[in-house]
Interface confidence: low
């Protein structure tokens, strides 16, 4: 999906009002320094591409983020403020329904959500800041 047509300011508002808080809730009890940010993005469409990938694509050790509150709100924001996004996600949604809800927050998932927090912060301050 091409994220260049999204309404970035509306998505930013959704992040600041709710998504950011849900990410913090998910990460509660984890030190902010526990994970190194290895994923970055250089501008807002690029950030949304990375956010979508980390939020909705199952990875080894963390297959279940898509049913988390922050993920559902992310999906809603993208569906509302990115023209045509919903249509591209129909197959992905059907596949998601077949997955079972996670029982335990694995360390891999915590690491992945930590990366997401970094991507969302970059979305709000777009431009790659190389370490």
């Amino acid at each position: 999906y091409d994220f260049t047509n999204c309404d970035f300011e509306k998505i930013k508002a959704a992040y600041l009002s709710t998504i950011s808080k849900d990410l913090i809730t998910y990460m509660s009890g984890t030190k902010s320094t526990e994970f190194n940010n290895t994923v970055s993005c250089s501008n807002r469409p690029h950030c949304l591409t990375e956010i979508q990938s980390l939020t909705f694509n199952p990875t080894a050790g963390c297959a279940s983020l898509a049913k988390e509150m922050f993920a559902m709100k992310t999906k809603a924001a993208l569906a509302i403020w990115c023209p045509g996004y919903s249509e591209t996600q129909i197959n992905a949604t059907q596949a998601m329904k077949k997955r079972r809800k996670r029982k335990v927050t694995t360390n891999k998932c915590l690491e992945q959500v930590s990366q997401l927090q970094g991507l969302w912060r970059r979305f709000n301050r777009p431009l790659l800041k190389q370490q």
Epitope: D2, T4, N5, S42, N43, P45, L127, L128, K129
Partner: antibody, heavy 117, light 107 residues
Framework: QVQLVQSGAEVKKPGASVKVSCKAS????????MHWVKQAPGQGLEWIGV????????TYNQKFKGKATLTVDTSTSTAYMELSSLRSEDTAVYYC??????????WGQGTLVTVSS | DIQMTQSPSSLSASVGDRVTITCRAS??????LAWYQQKPGKSPKLLVY???RPAAGVPSRFSGSGSGTDFTLTISSLQPEDFATYYC?????????FGQGTKVEIK
């Protein structure tokens, strides 16, 4: 309305330094990156570097590292670019321009820096 | 660094003509391309960003297209005020680079 107003033309001798200012108005200064672009006489545009006014993070085009130094004064919403060890090839119009996603939507009027002995 | 190559470097056209300027990136920049217009003694003016999105206040005769490495700026019907130099610029990642410019002159 958004405005970027730059300082006036400068004539400097080789080896000297010059500091160009860019005063921003009409928007929240710390919400946008401030870039500087060089245009030598009759030539194209060359990106020098960028500063984030919110935390003064800078990144430079490798070509201008050691030549240009970018700073900001958030109390006056002003960005500065200092050019050191001036040489004749530094003669150019220098623009400040703001961005959020890497494209430049508002530009200053330009400052001509002439290096001549 | 990503190199941006514009063609032609100059062209002559008449009022009412359809004008096309192309820009090629040395690697994939997706849709991260902007176009600017610059008149002598003036600052550049943003025309198009994200390859095809028109900047505020830009006349509809200006349009951008392309993605990946090949991009086009089209002026559907050239007006007297459109005679200027046009630059492309990638905004994919640092360092940002510009094309060498295309000068549009009166035939």
């Amino acid at each position: 309305q958004v405005q970027l107003v730059q300082s006036g033309a400068e004539v400097k001798k080789p080896g000297a330094s010059v500091k160009v200012s860019c005063k921003a108005s009409g928007y929240t200064f710390t919400s946008y990156w401030m870039h500087w672009v060089k245009q030598a006489p009759g030539q194209g545009l060359e990106w020098i570097g960028v500063i984030d006014p919110s935390d003064t993070y800078t990144t430079y085009n490798q070509k201008f590292k050691g030549k240009a130094t970018l700073t900001v004064d958030t109390s006056t919403s002003t960005a500065y670019m200092e050019l050191s060890s001036l040489r004749s090839e530094d003669t150019a119009v220098y623009y400040c321009t703001r961005s959020l996603d890497g494209f430049f939507d508002y530009w200053g009027q330009g400052t001509l820096v002439t290096v001549s002995s | 660094d990503i190199q941006m190559t514009q063609s032609p470097s100059s062209l002559s056209a008449s009022v009412g003509d359809r004008v096309t300027i192309t820009c090629r990136a040395s690697e994939n920049i997706y849709s991260y391309l902007a176009w600017y217009q610059q008149k002598p003694g003036k600052s550049p003016k943003l025309l198009v960003y994200f390859a095809r999105r028109p900047a505020a206040g830009v006349p509809s005769r200006f349009s951008g297209s392309g993605s990946g490495t090949d991009f086009t700026l089209t002026i559907s019907s050239l007006q007297p005020e459109d005679f200027a130099t046009y630059y492309c610029q990638h905004h994919y990642d640092t360092p940002w680079t510009f094309g060498q410019g295309t000068k549009v002159e009166i035939k």
